[in-house]
């Protein structure tokens, strides 16, 4: 069995299959790494485009395991970012191993937007609520923010009345359908026995990319009773 | 009540545009949801597009989804139909249409106050 002693120069293996994945705005690194004979630790950094004097900041040092959250190390989140991994071994170090870039905005999933649907009077009032993400460990919603570009820009909201689908647009820049909490969306109530179902996304701006779209919520309306 | 006058109609080719107005005056305009409707000869009134108080929520008949883009200027008291990709099967009068509160409606009876319509003729 070789010891580290023995390992030459550049005899450290590199981390491979660097990847960065995104939830609600958290990215966390992965890589995967050979099994050797002493437990490797690893160091990864994480380099921010369009940050002044930009260089590579530590984000975990010396780690066991083959995952570093670096949603502390993110900038704006819709400017690029690069990550590199490290392994040493004794006093020994590998080479880095580089990500792809990658922006959370555009590359990151964002979770679907809670939903509320009731009955008021003559009609149905939809809220739509902003799903909540975390940045720099802050948690907040990703409602319209004009110093950034990363923000939902439009719901497409989907009724479902009776068996045919109806999609709403609704702008979150406009103040009257929209606040920093939620969005609002009200449809008359047909005189009918209805049953309405509702489900909605969220698109980002710039990138056009999608929130998970949201479950369906229904309601059943009764000669003007109410069965949620 | 808002009275509203419809213009912008006309004859026009297939694959042309076309660009609706309708002027809203004798009550406050931003306190109404507007809608587009549209009667082709023979057929019932058809709900084509409608907008929210604010300008910020649309919904479109799937019959011209992608081709028509409804909006509004609460500033001059005037909706919009900017309709393109034109069709002879959207060869109607077209409406438009008031409803006061915030729900948006899909159906005539849902709106209370109407224009007299525009005529729109899309040759092939």
């Known amino acids: 069995e070789m010891g580290t002693a023995d390992l030459g120069p550049s005899s450290v293996p590199t981390p491979t299959n660097v990847t960065i994945e995104s939830y609600n705005m958290n990215p966390i690194v992965y890589w995967e790494y050979q099994i050797m004979p002493q437990v490797p630790v690893f160091t990864v950094e994480v380099k921010n485009y369009g940050v002044k004097n930009s260089e590579w900041i530590d984000a975990c040092i010396n780690i066991s395991h083959h995952y570093c959250n670096i949603s502390d190390h993110v900038g704006d989140p819709s400017n690029s970012l690069w990550v590199r991994v490290k392994a040493r071994v004794g006093q020994k170090e590998s080479a880095y191993a580089k990500s792809e870039e990658f922006a959370v905005c555009r590359d990151g999933k964002i979770g679907p937007p809670k939903l509320d649907i009731r009955k008021e009077e003559k009609q149905i009032m939809i809220d739509i609520f902003h799903p909540s993400v975390f940045v720099n460990g802050d948690e907040q919603e990703v409602d319209y923010d004009p110093e950034t570009t990363c923000y939902i820009r439009v719901y497409n909201v989907y009724v479902r009345m009776n068996g045919s689908e109806i999609q709403y647009k609704i702008l979150t820049q406009k103040e009257d359908d929209c606040d920093e909490i939620q969005c609002q969306l009200a449809i008359p109530v047909s005189s009918l026995n209805s049953q309405y179902c509702v489900s909605a996304e969220g698109v980002l701006h710039v990138w056009g990319v999608t929130t998970e779209k949201s479950k369906e919520v229904c309601i059943t309306i009764f000669n003007s009773s109410i069965k949620g | 009540e808002v009275q509203l006058v419809e213009s912008g109609g006309g004859l026009v080719q297939a694959g042309g545009s076309l660009r609706l107005s309708c002027a809203a005056s004798g009550s406050t305009f931003s306190t109404y949801v507007m809608g587009w409707f549209r009667q082709a000869p023979g057929k019932e009134r058809e709900f084509v597009a409608a907008i929210s108080r604010s300008g910020g929520t649309t919904t479109y008949a799937d019959s011209v989804k992608g081709r028509f883009d409804i909006s509004r200027d609460n500033g001059k008291n005037t909706l919009f139909l900017q309709m393109n990709s034109l069709i002879p099967e959207d060869t109607a009068a077209y409406y438009c249409?008031?409803?006061?509160?915030?729900?948006?409606?899909?159906?005539?009876?849902?709106?209370?106050?109407w224009g007299q319509g525009t005529l729109v003729t899309v040759s092939s």
């Open positions: 249409a008031a409803r006061a509160g915030p729900a948006i409606g899909r159906t005539a009876n849902d709106y209370h106050s």
